[in-house]
């Protein structure tokens, strides 16, 4: 004969556990149903009645099967330096990530809590390490024979043009000026234009501090705390 299927609520076998999408209620001492994502427990189970679930209200959510009595509040609206990459629904929190030209200086569980503008390397300095979604640009002084004449978060130091006859010698912030009509460029290794990083979703890493910060680096904090983790995890 096949084993009888127990319907919730039911008392688990001694030392046994409840099934998937059920939880052990310590007060009722029964295995009871969890509520699906997008819902919460409106009425907890008793020995004879199962959990009663209800939909999350506007601007609240549950992402997991759960038995929380209240849905979690969605995070506050994304700030001006951020873009909303995931909307607040009954089943998921809003996710804000940094917009292009910014990086995540302080990440949270999902998305970013604090965005900062990418450092711009001033003339005489080039990008040594490009910015990522979670780290700032690292600038370095242009080595002899190279220059950067821009204030940029993407431009690297480029080699001076090689003149047959030099009119004005180049320096770290200016290219050489030739009198000759056909100057040539020396090919320095890695002399390529670095694209601006595309901001997608933040990871849990801290930004690396670096020298030569351009004046006016700004930080913007979103309003309000991030919501707490749900009361139950997994299925």
């Amino acid at each position: 004969l096949p084993a009888q299927v127990a319907f919730t609520p039911y008392a688990p076998e001694p030392g046994g556990t409840c099934r998937l999408r059920e939880y052990y209620d310590q007060t009722a001492q029964m295995c009871c149903s969890k509520c699906p994502p997008g819902q919460h427990a409106k009425v907890f189970c008793t020995k004879t009645s199962d959990t009663v679930c209800d939909s999350c209200e506007d601007s609240t959510y549950t992402q997991l099967w759960n038995w929380v009595p209240e849905c979690l509040s969605c995070g506050s609206r994304c700030s001006s330096d951020q873009v909303e990459t995931q909307a607040c629904t009954r089943e998921q929190n809003r996710i804000c990530t940094c917009r292009p030209g910014w990086y995540c200086a302080l990440s949270k569980q999902e998305g970013c809590r604090l965005c900062a503008q990418l450092r711009k390397c001033r003339p005489g300095f080039g990008v040594a390490r490009p910015g990522t979604e979670t780290s700032d640009v690292v600038c370095k002084p242009c080595a002899p024979g190279t220059f950067s004449n821009t204030t940029s978060s993407t431009d690297i130091c480029r080699p001076h043009q090689i003149c047959h006859v030099v009119a004005i010698p180049g320096n770290a912030s200016m290219d050489a000026v030739c009198t000759s009509t056909s100057p040539t460029r020396s090919m320095a290794p890695g002399a390529v234009h670095l694209p601006q990083p595309v901001s997608t979703r933040s990871q849990h890493t801290q930004p690396t501090p670096a020298p030569s910060t351009a004046p006016g680096t700004s930080f913007l904090l979103p309003v309000g705390p991030s919501p707490p983790a749900e009361g139950s995890t997994g299925d």
Epitope: T27, A41, K42, F44
Partner: antibody
Framework: QVTLKESGPALVKPTQTLTLTCTFS??????????VGWIRQPPGKALEWLAH???????FYNPSLKSRLTISKDTSKNQVVLTMTNMDPVDTATYYC???????????WGQGTTVTVSS | DVQMTQSPSSLSASVGDRVTITCKAS??????IAWYQQKPGKAPKLLIH???TLQPGIPSRFSGSGSGRDYTFTISSLQPEDIATYYC????????FGGGTKVEIK
């Protein structure tokens, strides 16, 4: 609005049985998630949960007093009755009834009734 | 049974002071804690449930926080009408009240 009121004897003798009635209005014990419980408070001391009953007749008792307590309900009369046997002077207290929400906390309380156990 | 250890048992503070009361459970109670205010000769009044959810009509100077076994109740700026005894209630595993904290004005 929700109201609860306790009634019962003000004085009982040791070894006697105490019977308390909670009469409530503003909600029904036939509604899913509704419960009524009893809590007591000896003079100058802390609150102590005694027992409660749910809409589906599920009952819970304080483990340390379980052998002495019985709770029942009369849904049509909007009443819950608690009996406590073998009363002792240490059971002298103010006895409160309170409504329980579906998520198990007490949200509305009666004014309380004082019971003295003395010979 | 879950035991609830509430501290301090009494405190004296000035009007405008920040007042903090703690309750420690003997086991994890999953945020199922409520806080009540009781004035002499009156029934307890629910202030907060599920750790931090304020009841409608309760002033925002009252707040709650915590998780696991440790919970805190705070009055951000004590008012004369807040003089009372405060109790925590755990309802994660049956029901147990803390021993109470009597709040007085200096």
């Amino acid at each position: 609005q929700v109201t609860l009121k306790e009634s019962g004897p003000a004085l009982v003798k040791p070894t006697q049985t105490l019977t308390l009635t909670c009469t409530f209005s503003g909600f029904s014990l036939s509604t899913s998630g509704m419960g009524v419980g009893w809590i007591r408070q000896p003079p100058g001391k802390a609150l102590e949960w005694l027992a409660h009953i749910w809409w589906d007749d599920d009952k819970f008792y304080n483990p340390s007093l379980k052998s002495r307590l019985t709770i029942s309900k009369d849904t049509s009369k909007n009443q819950v009755v608690l009996t406590m046997t073998n009363m002792d002077p240490v059971d002298t207290a103010t006895y409160y009834c309170a409504r329980l929400t579906g998520t198990r906390y007490f949200d509305y309380w009666g004014q309380g009734t004082t019971v003295t156990v003395s010979s | 049974d879950v035991q609830m250890t509430q501290s301090p048992s009494s405190l004296s503070a000035s009007v405008g002071d920040r007042v903090t009361i703690t309750c420690k459970a003997s086991q994890d109670i999953n945020k199922f804690i409520a806080w009540y205010q009781q004035k002499p000769g009156k029934a307890p009044k629910l202030l907060i449930h599920y750790t931090s959810t304020l009841q409608p009509g309760i002033p925002s100077r009252f707040s709650g926080s915590g998780s696991g076994r440790d919970y805190t109740f705070t009055i951000s700026s004590l008012q004369p009408e807040d003089i009372a005894t405060y109790y925590c209630l755990q309802y994660g595993n049956l029901w147990t009240f803390g021993g109470g904290t009597k709040v007085e004005i200096k």
